[in-house]
């Protein structure tokens, strides 16, 4: 806490100036009038105060607002904001997306803060749902902010807010996550044709179930093995070999480098070791010649 | 439109002092802070020091510390920079520039020491 | 004394992207973000281009961009055109000293 001392003659502030950056913390805290900071907050970013003044400068924002900033201030606090605790944050009201992007703008370059996740945290409740300019806009800050969301968050996300997500927004993305997401993206995407699609579809795949799979093999989507190796295990597992070899196209030929890996492993488990020989790739590991199979879902669920 | 009028070029002996001038128009002139930067044929910005008129204080750059002397008039609106005991290597072009972050810069001086 | 490191110059063709670094210090670029750019032409005063890491005053193209990283900020110019060509300095304000430092400035060329 500063302590309270009468302002030195000549040095009250009449503006938020360039000056400032010359006076003790104990000069700011007597000859700035918390009222003046909060109408010219605009100007605090371009002067070059120490972190020691910014202290100062919170303190009497706090006490002018000991129920939370007004819209106004927090849209201009600028490097301020960096100040500011989760517990602050939550005082505040943030409905525009304006006052949004200029404080991550602030946080840009760095992780993710605790104050930066409260914030968007008040703001999307604020809203009510996730569309697709706060998206956009969190996406293009933190491209891994999709994936932070749990699967309940994940389901307030509108379909429309989907053609805001890049491939590389899902990169950390769980299989749970990818559930919720998938049939949102279906939907978004629904009125493209096939292969504008899959260009679309792809990168959430991993949330695809067994019939989707099926229906692309249809479609000489030619699938890579990276987006292969992240399906869902349970969703590849009753694809055919028929019906694998279509879906890859021409990328059939990297399962054998990853025989040893799921899903791929799995699969070939499931698979009989004839119609394994007939992709010509020296897959081993399925089930003989002669051998019945056992529906082992059904199996699972009895037992 | 803001603009900073810088006095004419000098030509001064080895040992001698030189003061350059820097007259602002079109902005408030107390509050902000301005700033004297050197350039030295073919080399780069080096900041000298500055000041805030309203204050009339000064702050200097350690390597001129003692050699330089910032002023301001509030009422011509005019700050000025003060280089005494002049040598060869002060030869330089001399700018006033307005703000920390230097909005605005004079069209420069050019100081030429030399016997 | 120069406190901030540049590289002596960088170079690119019509319409491409370049990117010039200055790295200082936790007490100057990284500890603040109050870094500038600055284009000087031959003969000319230096012209501000980006303040506050990343903010354009009014009048400059949204070609030049700036962002920092720790101890190293990045002046970016896009699209990159004949009259790009120039001397572009960092500086920032350095609170221990309460004053200005300069990079010792990168020469921009553009190819062609």
């Known amino acids: 806490e500063v302590e309270k001392t009468a302002c030195p003659s000549g040095k009250k502030a009449r503006e938020i100036d360039e000056s400032l950056i010359f006076y003790k913390k104990w000069e700011l805290e007597a000859c700035v009038d918390a009222a003046l900071l909060a109408t010219q907050m605009d100007r605090v970013n371009a002067i070059p105060f120490t972190y020691e003044q910014l202290d100062v400068l919170k303190h009497k924002l706090d006490e002018l607002y000991p129920q939370g900033y007004p819209e106004s201030v927090i849209q201009h606090l600028g490097y301020l904001f960096l100040k500011m605790s989760p517990e602050d944050i939550r005082k505040w009201n943030v409905t525009s997306l304006e006052t949004l992007k200029a404080l991550l703008e602030v946080n840009k370059g760095h992780e993710m803060s605790p104050q930066v996740a409260t914030l968007i945290d008040r703001f999307v409740k604020g809203r009510g749902q996730l569309d697709k300019d706060t998206l956009d806009t969190l996406t293009a800050f933190y491209p891994g902010y999709l994936c932070s969301l749990s699967p309940e968050e994940l389901s307030s996300v509108p379909p429309s807010s989907i053609w805001a997500v890049r491939p590389q927004d899902l990169d950390t993305c769980d299989p749970r996550q990818l559930d919720v997401l998938y049939p949102k993206a279906r939907l978004a995407f629904q009125n493209m044709n096939g292969s504008e699609y899959f260009v679309k579809i792809q990168s959430f795949l991993g949330g695809a179930p067994t019939e989707d799979l099926k229906a692309l093999s249809q479609q000489n989507v030619s699938m890579d093995l990276a987006t292969f190796m992240k399906l869902r295990t349970d969703a590849v597992l009753p694809l055919t070999v028929a019906e694998v070899q279509k879906l890859l196209g021409p990328h059939v030929e990297g399962l054998k480098a990853e025989e040893r890996h799921r899903p791929v492993r799995d699969w070939i488990l499931r698979q009989r070791q004839d119609d394994l020989d007939t992709l010509g790739l020296g897959l081993q590991g399925g089930i003989p010649n002669g051998y019945l199979v056992l529906d082992l879902s059904v199996q699972e669920a009895l037992s | 439109q803001v603009q900073l009028v810088q006095s004419g070029a000098e030509v001064k002996k080895p040992g001698s002092s030189v003061k350059v001038s820097c007259k602002a128009s079109?902005?408030?002139?107390?509050?902000?802070?301005f700033s004297w930067v050197r350039q030295a044929p073919g080399q780069g910005l080096e900041w000298m020091g500055g000041?805030?008129?309203?204050?009339?204080?000064?702050n200097y750059a350690q390597k001129f510390q003692g050699r330089v002397t910032i002023t301001a008039d509030e009422s011509t609106s005019t700050a000025y920079m003060e280089l005494s005991s002049l040598r060869s290597e002060d030869t330089a072009v001399y700018y006033c520039?307005?703000?920390?972050?230097?909005?605005?810069w004079g069209q420069g001086t050019l100081v030429t020491v030399s016997s | 004394d120069i406190a901030l490191t540049q590289p002596a110059s960088v170079s690119g063709s019509p319409g491409q992207s370049i990117t010039i670094s200055c790295t200082g210090t936790?007490?100057?670029?990284?500890?603040?973000?109050?870094v500038s750019w600055y284009q000087q032409h031959p003969g000319k005063a230096p012209k501000l281009m980006i303040y506050?890491?990343?903010k354009r005053p009014s009048g400059v193209s949204n070609r030049f961009s700036g962002s920092k990283s720790g101890n190293t900020a990045s002046l970016t110019i896009s699209g990159l055109q004949a009259e790009d060509e120039a001397d572009y300095y960092c500086?920032?304000?350095?609170?221990?000293?309460?004053?200005?430092?300069f990079g010792g400035g990168t020469k921009l060329t553009v190819l062609g």
């Open positions: 520039a307005r703000r920390t972050s230097m909005d605005y």
């Open positions: 079109g902005g408030t002139f107390s509050s902000y802070y």
């Open positions: 000041i805030i008129p309203k204050f009339g204080s000064a």
């Open positions: 936790s007490s100057d670029v990284g500890g603040y973000n109050y």
């Open positions: 506050s890491v990343s």
């Open positions: 500086g920032a304000w350095a609170h221990m000293s309460l004053g200005k430092v």
